[in-house]
């Protein structure tokens, strides 16, 4: 992957040797190179000092004067619009030395009828209109151009596509006399791709369509269509891949059933069923034909659509996703959790883990959280000792010129990383939890006790005393 070399003095663990890729054709930029240290073995410290000085002087060039901003471009084709008819658009930061393009789909729930779309327009207009969008945005997490923050793809061309269609990126209907709102999520993606071809995407080697939450589901719904679009436009050599963060939901039974009144309380199956009709939603063709007419909502659920996808997709999902819990009517209010709810939450983690068993490229930490890839600290969480950027790097390597066919995992470079411990925050690298009312940070032990876990029953399967377990959790081990 494109990442700055990390220099270590002797005595520290050396990095794995860089993997040399096939030499690029003449005129193509070189994105990685092997280093041979044999000639400087005797005087490594002085050599390192020179390299460090060189790196520091060159760094501003590669980081393009450290300007982190992505610049807004409204679509030239103004018929492809946000909900209110204003033109959709994208934020772009080019990296001319790179043939990698990252297109990120923003998330932000959805609305599925006139009433809750009106309410959304009043309270969250930015998610329905481009009228007040800022001229620039800062790239964070996987969209950052800083190697420290984004060791995975810091040098890629970065594109942030704001979510202003409220349709989980699936809609294909324009605003008219009859339709108060336009729902053009699927068309926005197609148009952005079309316009980016004229801005350098035509020379891409890899296009990674990424997204978080509703944007993560949007990846699953659109990644194959983008690949098909590029093929039809005469760019079959661009490898299209997907990265779906926090968009792999379950159509499970709610903890407490509520009527479909608003976006949050409506069971996801019912919300999507209504939404598809309202948005004129489109789903991947290969998935659609597996279900009867009117049952296309099934294709919004990762475990049902994933087996029908042709592009390689990496799935990132917290085992205890806050958005999933919200639609399941689980609200952790600060009161200690009763046993029935605790068992429900544990079972949710188990079910989610089960749906990922046949997903070779996945990263699923046992944490209570939502979204990760554009958080600045997205590098912190680990599953079985591997961070997400490292797992993505391994995924890139496993796909190198082989697409989805590669079956053998690379030694020491895992891509299937799903936590097996059974309760929220049993992974000590989980993001810190805050008490919903006091805002104070809770350590894992406090959180588990707050969740109503009896330390005795938690410690026993680990062969530990409760005091030992508490110590380990408090130390973050």
């Amino acid at each position: 992957s494109e990442g700055r070399k990390t220099w270590r003095r002797r005595g520290q663990q050396p990095p794995p040797p860089p993997r040399t890729e096939a030499a690029p054709a003449a005129g193509q930029p070189v994105e990685s190179f092997p280093l041979d240290f044999t000639a400087v073995e005797g005087n490594m410290d002085s050599f390192m000092a020179q390299v460090k000085s060189l790196a520091q002087s060159l760094y501003p060039c590669s980081a393009q004067q450290l300007n982190e901003d992505l610049r807004l471009h409204l679509l030239l084709n103004t018929s492809v619009t946000c909900n209110d008819g204003s033109p959709a658009g994208y934020y772009l930061k080019e990296s001319r030395g790179s043939r990698r393009w990252l297109l990120f789909l923003e998330g932000g729930w959805y609305c599925f009828n006139r009433e809750n779309c009106d309410s959304r327009y009043d309270t969250m207009r930015r998610l329905m209109s481009s009228r007040d969008w800022p001229r620039t945005r800062t790239g964070t997490g996987i969209l950052s151009s800083q190697p420290e923050e984004n060791p995975y793809w810091w040098n890629a061309n970065m594109v942030f596509i704001p979510y202003c269609s409220s349709d989980v990126w699936s809609g294909a209907s324009s605003k008219s006399e009859k339709n108060e709102y336009a729902f053009m999520g699927a068309l926005i993606i197609q148009e952005v791709v079309r316009e980016l071809l004229g801005r350098g995407l035509s020379g891409a080697k890899v296009l990674l369509l990424a997204g978080s939450s509703a944007g993560g589901t949007g990846v699953l719904l659109n990644v194959d269509r983008v690949a098909e679009q590029l093929e039809k436009l005469g760019y079959p050599a661009i490898q299209v891949r997907g990265l779906a963060d926090s968009g792999w939901f379950l159509d499970n039974k709610q903890y407490r059933h509520t009527d479909c009144v608003d976006t949050i309380t409506c069971a996801p199956t019912e919300a999507i069923r209504r939404g598809i009709r309202y948005w004129n939603g489109v789903v991947p063709e290969r998935c659609r034909r597996q279900f009867q007419e009117g049952e296309e909502w099934n294709c919004f659920f990762g475990y049902k659509v994933y087996p029908t996808l042709r592009c390689p997709v990496f799935v990132v999902q917290w085992l205890f996703d806050e958005a999933q819990l919200t639609v399941d009517n689980v609200h952790l209010t600060g009161q200690p959790v009763q046993e029935g709810l605790r068992l429900y939450i544990q079972n949710l983690g188990r079910e989610l883990r089960h749906t990922l068993k046949d997903v070779p490229a996945s990263f699923a930490p046992a944490c209570l959280s939502h979204e990760i890839i554009i958080r600045s600290h997205w590098t912190d969480v680990q599953v079985k000792g591997t961070s997400l950027p490292r797992a993505l790097h391994c995924w890139d390597r496993s796909l190198h010129d082989s697409h989805k066919a590669s079956k053998t995992p690379l030694k020491g470079c895992p891509v299937h990383l799903v936590d097996s411990c059974p309760w929220p925050h049993c992974n000590p690298s989980c993001p810190t939890v805050r008490d919903q009312f006091t805002g104070q940070e809770m350590n894992v032990a406090q959180f588990l006790m707050h969740m109503g876990f009896d330390m005795q029953t938690v410690a026993q399967p680990q062969g530990l005393e409760p005091s030992e377990l508490l110590g380990m959790l408090s130390n973050g081990s």
Partner: antibody, heavy 119, light 107 residues
Framework: QVQLKQSGPGLVQPSQSLSITCTVS????????VHWVRQSPGKGLEWLGV???????DYNVAFISRLSISKDNSKSQVFFKMNSLQADDTAIYYC?????????????WGRGTTLTVSS | DIQMNQSPSSLSASLGDTITITCHAS??????LSWYQQKPGNFPKLLIF???NLHTGVPSRFSGSGSGTGFTLTISNLQPEDIATYYC?????????FGGGTQLEIK
């Protein structure tokens, strides 16, 4: 275990139609597609069409005007009908199951219905 | 339509040999290719799907490789029960199409 059983006539007059029923067991038609493939010495294996689990169909354009496929989920049956038969439609006709997947291949086949078109 | 050209059309080998059958697609089909075995008087049986994945119950002496337009089926340590005709099939686009077959016999 997974089985596809075919029933249909062996001999049909030219210009008449062929009807074959494929009755499946060991899986549900609401979860799997069923394809139709024929095999003749002159043309080898030819794909004719498919009935998807959702109830939609796809046909080989070369046969679309005279082919129809339907099904009854409750009876676990898929029906194949081809009109205006000619001598070169003489072949073995197979139904075959297609898994829920990202491309079409056939993991289980029926034993075939041998058809001769002759007056 | 995508044409699938299989070669050789017939092949004679000895027991214990390793043989290779190739299949060439007229356009890029990625890895969307399957291999079938058909014994005389029987229906085709799936051996390999997605270019290299062995179907359940198929002996490990069968293997598949390739992507794009060129694919191979390899049978190592040839056994008497491998006498059959072998077909490739593309699943990239409709209409689905098959190779003309390779008839394998034992010397």
């Amino acid at each position: 275990q997974v089985q596809l059983k075919q029933s249909g006539p062996g001999l049909v007059q030219p210009s008449q139609s062929l009807s074959i029923t494929c009755t499946v067991s060991g899986f549900s038609l609401t979860n799997y597609g069923v394809h139709w493939v024929r095999q003749s010495p002159g043309k080898g294996l030819e794909w004719l069409g498919v009935m998807w689990s959702g109830g939609s169909t796809d046909y080989n354009v070369a046969f679309i005007s005279r082919l129809s496929i339907s099904k009854d989920n409750s009876k676990s049956q898929v029906f194949f009908k081809m009109n205006s038969l000619q001598a070169d439609d003489t072949a073995i006709y197979y139904c075959a199951r297609s898994p829920y997947s990202n491309y079409d291949y056939f993991d289980y086949w029926g034993r075939g219905t041998t058809l001769t078109v002759s007056s | 339509d995508i044409q699938m050209n299989q070669s050789p059309s017939s092949l004679s080998a000895s027991l214990g040999d390793t043989i290779t059958i190739t299949c060439h697609a007229s356009q890029n089909i990625n890895v969307w290719l399957s291999w079938y075995q058909q014994k005389p008087g029987n229906f085709p049986k799936l051996l390999i799907f997605k270019a290299s994945n062995l179907h359940t119950g198929v002996p490990s002496r069968f293997s598949g490789s390739g992507s794009g337009t060129g694919f191979t089926l390899t049978i190592s340590n040839l056994q008497p029960e491998d006498i059959a005709t072998y077909y490739c099939q593309q699943g990239q686009s409709y209409p689905l199409t098959f190779g003309g077959g390779t008839q394998l016999e034992i010397k």
